[in-house]
């Protein structure tokens, strides 16, 4: 029997019946064995076929077989119901070898020309499988010349058998208090040859509860307990299972905080697997009862390990742990069934005793000593000498624990001294210097410090004076001895004040005229206002209307009198304002330099002389009565004048205060 070509020779060629294309002889038997390389198969087709037709091809035939399997027995020229001729069919070996046998019997009724066939080796596509046959690979099949290989989807690994995909299903750890886990691909069939381990690991104190849900289908056996595929559940206390079959296992209350679930599958079967819903429980904590005036959040039916709640107080109430205020409160349930913190109280906000108001008092409106939420207090200032600035003095204890005014201010109101009060009434007559009576000039300040000078009290801690009077002490403010509340210059009965700082107008040049002759002294303490110590008012914008030419102002001081000595008793003089041009002209002639009188000055006195301020009065106030407010205000500051006080045709020159209101206000607000 002639043999066909053997691999690795090129595997292709032609086969023909003996004598082709002539007729074949009787009693012929010819056999060809074709072999292809591994991973290849043989393809064969006929270009000519003419054999004697017989029932079931018993007489003459061509038989194709591959291994033990007969692929076809062929005869005739065309196929019939019981016989087959190749026609245009192509035949394929099952493996890499193909046997072809030709046989003719002892006779032919007429001549037959036999057959001609061609063959070739071709790659087998192992990935193509016939319907109903098992796939070559579990997941992905990759064909190549001479062979194939399998690969797996993510989450799987190729088994040793090179075809099966085992699930990578170990090492998953569940730490949430509840969750779901299932067999790989659930509810689709689970993978073969897999070993899965799942862990549920909760904090100590929790107990895991397992519920099998939906469906359960794990390969089983009628006689043996779960020999193929099985599910096992292990805790530190006991083992549950193995489980298999189609019945949902019962709930498992593990009484453990750690559970290991093992699922093992073999190489066969087609089952959907399982799904577990797990929950956990723990020893519950006592139900939190909200304190009066508070509420619990969130509200739950029960609270177990790690559950928490917060307490929120109603408006006007605050969280207190005993005496300790809390910004917030959250308690957490512990594993022993107790809360980690004791329940706080929601106590009514207490603003506490209100601060004392300097020069004022406070009255409890709601009730004696009541300082809790919504309580009302009323501040008021000491009558006559103080007036309330900023608000009406009514404060309410608000939810933030602060006394708050109706305007929303949390700072105290201010009792500002009433200015410009005097016991003196003015008749408008001009007459000689007179002794002041108690309460006539309560703003009068005596300044001692090298020389005698004067000033006027502003508010309750500032003194307005002339720059030249305190220039020497500008760097040594504490050297100034400031006295008030007395009429007698030498009296031991006075209110002492001390200077904290001296502010001289930056436009003042010492010994170079008296322009900007103005200064402020800040006292180191506030003085108590009474009928003998009261501040002078600063001029309003409209004050110029009370300071026209011939309007009467009053100067007071302990300066030199006609007798040439400092006055023992406070003296005052009423003098008219002098026309500015007239005054300027009076000081244009020698010995006064031109421009001595500036727009920052005003003049007062009699043309005939005799009434004037003098040395020792420097810094004192020239005051006017504001007939609208009925308060006295400072219009001028005693500054300079002729060498001989009260000289005819000469006038007292005063710093014009209204020009310096912004300067005064800036310094007082800044310091």
């Amino acid at each position: 029997t002639p043999l066909g070509p053997k691999w690795p020779e090129p595997v292709f060629g032609r086969l023909a019946s003996p004598g082709f294309p002539g007729e074949y002889a009787n009693d012929q038997e010819r056999r060809w064995t074709l072999t292809a390389p591994p991973g290849y198969r043989l393809r064969l087709y006929f270009t000519h076929f003419d054999l004697e037709l017989s029932h079931l091809c018993e007489y003459d035939f061509v038989k194709l077989s591959s291994g033990a399997k007969v692929l076809a027995t062929l005869c005739g020229q065309e196929s019939t119901d019981t016989e087959r001729a190749p026609g245009k069919d192509t035949f394929y070996s099952l493996g890499s070898s193909l046997d072809i046998t030709f046989r003719s019997d002892y006779s032919n009724e007429k001549p037959f020309t036999g057959f001609e066939a061609f063959y070739a080796a071709e790659d087998i596509d192992e990935c193509q499988v016939a319907p109903g046959e098992a796939p070559t690979c579990d997941h992905h099949c990759h064909n190549h010349l001479g062979g194939f290989y399998c690969s797996c989807r993510a989450g799987y690994v190729l088994h040793r058998n090179k075809r099966t995909c085992s699930a990578l299903c170990s090492g998953q750890v569940f730490t949430q208090r509840s969750g779901e886990l299932s067999s790989p691909e659930y509810p689709r069939p689970y993978p073969k040859l897999s070993s899965c381990t799942y862990s549920i690991s909760l904090e100590e104190g929790f107990s895991v509860i397992l519920d099998f849900v939906e469906s359960f289908d794990v390969e089983t056996h009628p006689e043996t307990l779960c020999p193929y595929d099985f599910l096992k559940i292990q805790t530190d206390r006991e083992e549950h299972g193995p489980f298999c079959g189609k019945t949902l296992p019962h709930r498992i209350e593990t009484k453990s905080n750690t559970v290991t679930i093992t699922f093992v599958t073999d190489e066969s079967g087609d089952h959907t697997g399982w799904k577990i819903h797990y929950t956990s429980t723990a020893q519950p904590c006592p139900y939190p009862m909200a304190p009066p005036n508070g509420h619990v959040s969130p509200v739950q039916a029960k609270y177990i390990l790690k559950d928490s709640f917060s307490i929120f107080c109603e408006t006007g109430y605050e969280l207190l742990q005993g005496h300790l205020p809390l910004k917030s409160f959250t308690a957490v349930c512990q594993k022993d069934g107790s809360w980690d913190r004791p329940m706080p109280a929601c106590s009514i906000v207490d603003c506490g005793p209100p601060d004392d108001l300097p020069s004022g008092r406070v009255e409890y409106i709601t009730g004696p000593g009541v300082t809790t939420y919504k309580a009302v207090i009323q501040y008021s200032c000491e009558e006559t000498f103080y007036t309330m600035k900023v608000n009406d003095g009514k404060y309410v204890c608000e939810a933030d624990g602060f006394w708050t005014s109706s305007k929303g201010e949390k700072s105290l109101p201010v009792c500002e001294p009433v200015c410009g009060l005097s016991a003196r009434t003015t008749g408008g007559r001009i007459y000689g210097g007179q002794k002041a009576k108690p309460g006539d000039f309560p703003w009068q300040v005596l300044i001692l410090g090298g020389t005698t000078a004067a000033g006027a009290l502003l508010y309750d801690n500032w003194v307005l004076t002339a720059a030249h009077a305190v220039y020497e002490q500008k760097h040594d403010a504490s050297a100034l001895d400031i006295r008030m509340g007395t009429l007698k210059r030498l009296s031991p009965h006075y209110t002492q004040a001390w200077s904290e700082a001296v502010f001289i107008h930056e436009g003042y040049t010492h010994d170079a005229g008296f322009d900007n002759d103005i200064a402020l002294i800040k006292l180191n303490n506030k003085v108590v206002i009474n009928s003998n110590i009261t501040p002078i008012c600063l001029p309003r914008k409209e004050a110029e209307s009370f300071m026209r030419t011939d309007d009467i102002g009053t100067a007071s001081g302990w300066g030199l009198t006609q007798r040439g000595f400092l006055a023992r008793n406070l003296m005052y003089v009423d003098i008219p304002i002098v026309d500015h041009q007239k005054c300027t002209a009076a000081y244009e002639k020698p010995p006064y330099p031109r421009g001595s009188v500036t727009a920052n000055m005003l003049c007062a006195g009699l043309e005939s002389g005799g009434k004037d301020s003098c040395r020792g009065d420097s810094g004192g106030a020239l005051v006017f009565l504001d007939s609208e407010t009925e308060r006295w205000f400072v219009g001028g500051i005693v500054s300079w004048g002729s060498m001989n006080c009260g000289e005819a045709g000469q006038y007292g020159v005063y710093t014009k205060v209204i020009n310096y209101i912004p300067w005064i206000e800036n310094i007082i607000s800044d310091f």
């Epitope: 304190p291 005993g322 005496h323 205020p325 329940m343 109280a345 106590s347 207490d350």
Partner: antibody, heavy 118, light 112 residues
Framework: QVQLQQSGPDLVKPGTSVKISCTAS????????INWVKQRPGQGLEWIGW????????YYNENFKGRAMFTVDYSSSSAYMLLSSLTSEDSAVYFC???????????WGQGTLVTVSA | DVVMTQTPLTLSVTIGQPASISCKSS???????????LNWLLQRPGQSPKRLIY???KLDSGVPDRFTGSGSGADFTLKISRVEAEDLGVYYC?????????FGTGTKLEIK
């Protein structure tokens, strides 16, 4: 005025329990915490814990957890301390105190002497 | 726990003379609201303790102004300007800032 009246002295056997009462008057009982303090003979003071009558919520010093239990009775404005598993170490004077916003020890009861002896 | 250390253990003072007791805590007693919950108590012989001073320096009503409390953080002092016979007893400092509240070891004031 605020008053805290405590129950009288008690002689108890080791291993048993004792319940001390503290009856409050002169203020709203539910508004302020009640503290309990232990003083052993000739020794210093030790805070046992407190209870807030407004919620009935107690808090215990770890040294007394599991042995001391605080309760309140609103009808009599009374606070109670139950001390269990007594030993000779528990022989002491026990005080109840009431706090205010400035601290827990503003007002003191007169004290209850507990003697643990076989 | 916060440890409260008092010195001296015993103080022997002549009537009319000043006295001073120190109390140190193992950590600051300043609470988050800016207040320091440090009290001074006096326990006269055979009596319950009585609070003299709260919030470091505030005197309870009825307490004579010869008692003054001072300090901050973890260092506190109780001073008596002129000791009187009724002042004898054991003085305790106690903190109410941290749980559990803790007492000082006590200082016994004796009259010389």
């Amino acid at each position: 005025q605020v008053q805290l009246q405590q129950s009288g002295p008690d002689l108890v056997k080791p291993g048993t329990s004792v319940k001390i009462s503290c009856t409050a008057s002169g203020y709203t009982f539910t508004d302020y915490y009640i503290n309990w303090v232990k003083q052993r003979p000739g020794q210093g003071l030790e805070w046992i814990g407190w209870i807030f009558p407004g919620s009935g919520s107690p808090y215990y010093n770890e040294n007394f957890k599991g042995r001391a239990m605080f309760t309140v009775d609103y009808s009599s404005s009374s606070a109670y301390m139950l001390l269990s598993s007594l030993t000779s170490e528990d022989s002491a004077v026990y005080f109840c105190t009431r706090g205010d916003r400035s601290g827990p020890f503003a007002y003191w009861g007169q004290g209850t002497l507990v003697t643990v002896s076989a | 726990d916060v440890v409260m250390t008092q010195t001296p253990l015993t103080l022997s003072v002549t009537i009319g003379q000043p006295a001073s007791i120190s109390c140190k805590s193992s950590q600051s007693l300043l609470y988050s609201n800016g207040k320091t919950y440090l009290n001074w108590l006096l326990q006269r012989p055979g009596q319950s303790p009585k609070r003299l001073i709260y919030l470091v320096s505030k005197l309870d009503s009825g307490v004579p102004d010869r008692f003054t409390g001072s300090g901050s953080g973890a260092d506190f002092t109780l001073k008596i300007s002129r000791v009187e016979a009724e002042d004898l007893g054991v003085y305790y400092c106690v903190q109410g800032t941290h749980f559990p509240f803790t007492f000082g070891t006590g200082t016994k004031l004796e009259i010389k």
